[in-house]
């Protein structure tokens, strides 16, 4: 699987999950989140050659098409597969509120 | 929706479904399929700017991150959303066999 366990410990050139830290204030302009100040969101990057973690029948076909037509702009793309939530704390007035933000952290990628 | 109805009738620069015809023999090297000779597979292409048909909370965050950090390599990617099957005919000996290939045709795209 193209997950953090594999990708963070290898020098994989093809589609894999990469490290990315997002600072809520600096990178998103969100000043109201109290904790955390930012988080390891990660992102997906890398080419999707034929047979590399292909998601559907279509992505297999497209990767094969791409192999036969190397100059084509049609190719599978490396995108998130498994996403995890992130708990945040913010203040509503002086009262702290905990909220679970769904689908915020990339754990693995796929070629789609 | 970034579907064939909208995308094929517009000059949309952002993520949208584009026309692509795949010839089984020429483009994939598949000589065994009797009918059809090829099909309109389509593909997804175009940038995924902030607010453009974003798939998950994560893709919204990443697009916003990208807006604040234009040089970053982390950005959502335009990939298939709705896929449709394709019926094919091939011969097993002299007996024609009809098979439904699932997820073969792109009907719409999303930013993931």
């Amino acid at each position: 699987a193209l997950d953090t366990n594999y990708c963070f410990s290898s020098t994989e050139k093809n589609c894999c999950v990469r490290q990315l830290y997002i600072d809520f204030r600096k990178d998103l302009g969100w000043k109201w989140i109290h904790e955390p100040k930012g988080y390891h969101a990660n992102f997906c990057l890398g080419p999707c050659p034929y047979i590399w973690s292909l998601d559907t029948q279509y992505s297999k076909v497209l990767a094969l098409y791409n192999q036969h037509n190397p100059g084509a702009s049609a190719a599978p793309c490396c995108v998130p597969q498994a996403l995890e939530p992130l708990p945040i704390v913010y203040y509503v007035g002086r009262k702290p509120k905990v909220e679970q933000l769904s689908n915020m952290i990339v754990r693995s990628c796929k070629c789609s | 929706a970034l579907d064939t109805n909208y995308c094929f009738s517009s000059t949309e620069k952002n993520c949208c479904v584009r026309q692509l015809y795949i010839d089984f023999r020429k483009d994939l090297g598949w000589k065994w399929i009797h009918e059809p000779k090829g099909y309109h597979a389509n593909f997804c292409l175009g940038p995924c700017p902030y607010i453009w048909s974003l798939d998950t909370q994560y893709s919204k965050v990443l697009a916003l991150y990208n807006q604040h950090n234009p040089g970053a390599s982390a950005a959502p990617c335009c990939v298939p959303q709705a896929l449709e099957p394709l019926p094919i005919v091939y011969y097993v000996g002299r007996k024609p066999k009809v098979e439904q290939l699932s997820n073969m045709i792109v009907r719409s795209c999303k930013c993931s």
Epitope: L28, W30, Y90, K97 | I51, V61
Partner: antibody
């Protein structure tokens, strides 16, 4: 420049629902909280609740809990406020207003022009 | 809910007068070194306009004749020299507690 443009006046019957829209421009819609405030004729201001467009997070005034729903469409930078089971005392001007952004509950620096909702049988 | 009591509810004044409006919160609105109190101006048929935020900070574009002061439960909005365009209703607002609440308003009329 920042602009919040609201939908037009509505006349509704008691028991019906109303959905008011607020189209934002001139700033990053998903980076600030959007509030809804109402004002009955000749009365003061009353905060109804708020939504953070990027996440869909909401905080509602308990007075309206269960009767109000705030949503957004980030593709069009539009916020919506739906109020159900309307009564005659819901007759008011409804405003959307952008929070200044340091906190969830905050001061509001830009306001829509207001939408008059009249509830009458 | 935190109750916000404004006084007076209305006042008559002349151009050039110094005008003071007070707002009392039913409990302290101080937190983390800030006073979570704001002031707005509203003219008939128009939306409110933010004048002062966090008790004493002048909103961008607001004339310097407007000022705010106070902490804890007692706050003041002062207009140093009333101008014709200042005749309006003024509201205070707290955001220390959910729900956010406004004062009942002070109407400033021409004498």
């Amino acid at each position: 420049q920042v602009q919040l443009v609201q939908s037009g006046a509505e006349v509704k019957k008691p028991g019906a629902s109303v959905k008011v829209s607020c189209k934002a421009s001139g700033y990053t819609f998903t980076s600030e909280w959007m509030n809804w405030v109402r004002q009955a004729p000749g009365q003061g201001l009353e905060w109804m609740g708020q939504i953070f467009p990027a996440l869909g997070s909401t905080n509602y005034n308990e007075m309206y809990e269960g009767r109000v729903t705030m949503t957004t469409d980030t593709s069009t930078s539009t916020a919506y406020m739906e109020l159900r089971s309307l009564r005659s005392d819901d007759t008011a001007v409804y405003y959307c207003a952008r929070g200044i952004g340091n906190y969830a509950l905050d001061a509001m620096d830009y306001w829509g022009q207001g939408t008059l909702v009249t509830v009458s049988s | 809910d935190i109750q916000m009591t404004q006084s007076p509810s209305s006042l008559s004044a002349s151009v050039g007068d110094r005008v003071t409006i007070t707002c009392r919160a039913s409990e302290s609105v101080d937190f983390y070194g800030n006073s979570f109190m704001h002031w707005y101006q509203q003219k008939p048929g128009k939306a409110p306009k933010l004048l002062i935020y966090l008790a004493s900070n002048l909103e961008s574009g607001v004339p310097s004749r407007f000022s705010g002061s106070g902490s804890g439960t007692d706050f003041t909005l002062t207009i140093s020299s009333l101008q014709p365009e200042d005749f309006a209703t003024y509201y205070c607002q707290q955001n220390i507690e959910d729900p956010l609440t406004f004062g009942g308003g002070t109407k400033v009329e021409i004498k």
